[in-house]
Every structure is written in C-alpha cells, then in structure tokens.
Interface confidence: medium
C-alpha cells in the first residue's frame, strides 16, 4: 500500500486525518456535557484510490471489484484505524462525573 | 442505532451485507490462488442515514457534523463490523498450501 503522503490524486486529497472544530451545540451535547465546550474532532476524510492505505484483504478485493463494477460496488472508504481516548466532564443526576470515551477521536486512518 | 431492516430510505437501501460473485481473474488472484475459482464475496454496501447502525461515538459525531458541514465532513460509511474467515488454496514456491484469511469476507456491517 502507498504511504499516506503519496496520493495519486494530489497532495492531501487521499484518506488522512483531519481536524474539525465543533462546539457542544454542533455535536448536540450541550444538555449533558459540561466540558470541554469545544472539541477538536479528529476524523478520517479523503479518497481511497487503488490500494491506498488498504486496511486488509477485504479492502483490496473491494478495490478490484469497484474497478469492474463501479455501479454495484463502492470504492473503499476512509475510516478510523484506531482512536485516541477523550475525557468528557458530564452532568449526572447526582452531580458531575468524568467519563473517558475510547471511540470518539480518530487517531489514524485507513481505507476499507 | 436502528436495526438493519429499518431503513428510512426504503427497504434494502441502507448499509447491509451484500454478496458479489467474483472469479479469481476478477480479483487478480489467478496466478497465486488455486481454489476456489469463484468467490462469493460478502461486502458492506448501502447508505448510512442519521444514526443508522452507528458503530460508535465517532460515527454519531460524524453524522452531526455532516449535517452541519456536508461539503467538509462526509456521511458515515458502511463498512464491515466483523469478518468470516475463508480458506484459500494457494500456490507456493514449494507446492500448495492452505491459508486461512480472517479479513476477507465481511460478516456484518455498521456505519462509521
């Protein structure tokens, strides 16, 4: 698989980690999260051309079949390969609690 | 998350398991795989409308941000949640070997 910078579509256009700033209101969390009031959401965005960051055998198959049957089989999709944990301070019935979420922020990306 | 049959876009249009028949030639495997000569490839295809089969918190965030910034943040994508193993009989330098691939056939799907 090509490395992350070797995008045949041009620099930065292939599957990679992006950061999107979002408020609690944007996320629909304002009524249950106290802090942070703004989240730097890391997510996987970009195209998955042939064999670029292919996650596994399934991704390779998908690429091959997409070439043959583009109307039936979609191209692989840029999704998180792993996550970074994030702590939220949230409201509870009895007060406030710290909660760690392991599946909230993308850490790195691949195509599948 | 809604269950697999509760697709707001109409029956069968949301993220679910599909089977695509593919030959070794289709997959580009003809020179190293002996058998099977045809594979029933199970893969995840379909739309991921709001919270449909959301895999985790990240998928929920992605849905919210896609609504706000559709040109920047893509909708969640339909990908395998788990895989079924598949045995391939492949040619090796010394003869023929049985190889089990754990990441070849999608078993079930979710949106992420």
């Amino acid at each position: 698989a090509r490395n992350g910078d070797d995008c045949p579509l041009g620099p930065g256009r292939c599957c990679r980690l992006h950061t999107v700033r979002a408020s609690l209101e944007d996320l629909g969390w304002a009524d249950w999260v106290l802090s942070p009031r703004e989240v730097q959401v890391t997510m996987c965005i970009g195209a998955c051309p042939s064999q670029f960051r292919a996650a596994n055998m399934h991704a390779q198959i998908k690429t091959s079949l997409h070439r043959l049957k583009p109307d039936t089989v979609p191209a692989p999709c840029c999704v998180p390969a792993s996550y970074n944990p994030m702590v939220l301070i949230q409201k509870t019935d009895t007060g406030v609690s710290l909660q760690t979420y392991d599946d909230l922020l993308a850490k790195d990306c691949h195509c599948i | 998350a809604r269950n697999g049959d509760d697709c707001p876009l109409g029956p069968g249009r949301c993220c679910r398991l599909h089977t695509v028949r593919a030959s070794l030639e289709d997959l580009g495997w003809a020179d190293w795989v002996l058998s099977p000569r045809e594979v029933q490839v199970t893969m995840c295809i379909g739309a991921c409308p709001s919270q449909f089969r959301a895999a985790n918190m990240h998928a929920q965030i992605k849905t919210s941000l896609h609504r706000l910034k559709p040109d920047t943040v893509p909708a969640p994508c339909c990908v395998p949640a788990s895989y079924n193993p598949m045995v391939l009989i492949q040619k090796t330098d010394t003869g023929v070997s049985l190889q089990t691939y754990d990441d070849l056939l999608a078993k079930d799907c979710h949106c992420i």
């Epitope: - | 003809a30 020179d31 002996l34 058998s35 099977p36 000569r37 045809e38 029933q40 079924n84 193993p85 598949m86 045995v87 391939l88 009989i89 023929v96 049985l98 089990t100």
Partner: antibody, heavy 119, light 111 residues
C-alpha cells in the same frame, strides 16, 4: 487434531429413509466445505454431495439427486445427509470428508458409517 | 461429466521396484494454470488418504517416493521404490467441475 465421526448408518428397507450425521472437531468447521463420498461393498469410491462452508452452494451426484439432501449446522459443527427413497444400490459405507472449497480435494476422511438397504 | 479411467486394474510389483498408475479423463480437467486431479491411497479396512493434489503437489507427510504428473486428460501416479506398506488401492479424482468423479481404482500388490 482433525476428526470426522459419522453416525446414523444401519439397515433400512427399500423406499425407507435414513439420516447420517458427521461430527467435526479440530478445525474451524464453518470455514470449510464438506462432502459425502460412498463406497459400495467391494467397489470403488463415488462422490455423493457437496456443501459450501456457508451452506449456500450445494451439488449432488446424478445418482442421488432429488432423493438425498446435504445440510450443515455450523453452530453444532455437524454435517448431515438426509437419505430418502433408498434403493438397494445405495448400500455402501458413507464417508464424511472435508472438501475445503470447490475445485479442491478431500484432505480428511471419517472412518465411515455403513448403510444397508435390503428387504 | 468427466469419466476417469484408470489403468491397469491391478499391479503386482516387487519390493523396491517402480510402480506406475495411469488415469485418463474423458475431457480435460485442467485450466491454463492448474490441473484439478488428485490421487488417494486406500488400505484394506481404512478410509482413503490423500497423496497428491493438483496433479503434482505432494500432500504434507506423504513420502517423496510418490509423485504425480500430467495435464489435460492424461495423468500418472508413480511410486519410485515400492515398499510393503504401499499395498492398497489407488484412486484418481477430479474436481474441475461438478460432478466430481473418481477413477475405478488400481490395486497394488507385492509380487
């Protein structure tokens, strides 16, 4: 260690039915296609039926088509052969075999179970 | 359907001598890349045992005195130096397409 253990054989009258079972162990049953092969007394081997790993592809020899049904229960690691409308020429030792996939070979065989069709 | 015809029906060989068994298919069991022909040995009172797969590939654990060759319609199993434990019936089998078929068998005995 791979093991295939057949059961369910016995004596049955022509026109009768019998259900053979094959209990598999020592490998991931759900990953492998399976077949039944039979051998009439003093005769050669005859392939009977094939079922793919997920049970979606099934093939039969012409001699048993419409009378025999191959099936599997991957949750129980068990292969079955339902035999209806039995004929005297179905008398044989029935072997459960691991067939891997289509276009493959039989790499493991059970010890066989004997089916006798006689009036 | 591809009918497999084995020859000879039986073979008596002296210990240490070479044995050759032939299998002819009524139509090709090969593709441009592979031959879907396999060989089995069956000893008295036992289930068959795989010897050779895809015409020429030795199954793991099988002595290298066994070898297979051929393509298309004509295939051969050879035992370079026959040993006492090689007594039994040998079958060819194709898996080019369904229905899979076996040859009629060749009985190998010690002279």
């Amino acid at each position: 260690e791979v093991q295939l253990v057949e059961s369910g054989g016995g004596l049955v009258k022509p026109g009768g039915s019998l259900r053979l079972s094959c209990a598999a162990s020592g490998f991931t049953f759900s990953s492998y296609a399976m077949s039944w092969v039979r051998q009439a007394p003093g005769k050669g081997l005859e392939w009977v039926a094939y079922i793919s790993s997920g049970g979606d592809n099934i093939y039969y020899a012409d001699t048993v088509k419409g009378r025999f049904t191959i099936s599997r229960d991957n949750s129980k690691n068990t292969l079955y052969l339902q035999m209806n409308s039995l004929k005297t020429e179905d008398t044989a030792v029935y072997y459960c075999t691991r067939a891997l996939v289509e276009n493959a070979y039989f790499d493991y065989w059970g010890q066989g179970t004997t089916v006798t069709v006689s009036s | 359907d591809s009918v497999l015809t084995q020859s000879p029906d039986s073979l008596a060989v002296s210990l240490g001598e070479r044995a050759t068994i032939n299998c002819r298919a009524s139509k090709s069991v090969s593709t441009s890349t592979y031959s879907y022909m396999h060989w089995y040995q069956q000893k008295p009172g036992q289930p068959p045992k795989l010897l050779i797969k895809y015409a020429s590939y030795l199954e793991s654990g099988v002595p290298d005195r066994f070898s297979g060759s051929g393509s298309g319609t004509d295939f051969t199993l050879k035992i370079s130096r026959v040993e006492a434990e090689d007594v039994g019936v040998y079958y060819c089998q194709h898996s080019r397409e369904f229905p899979w078929t076996f040859g009629g068998g060749t009985k190998v005995e010690i002279k």
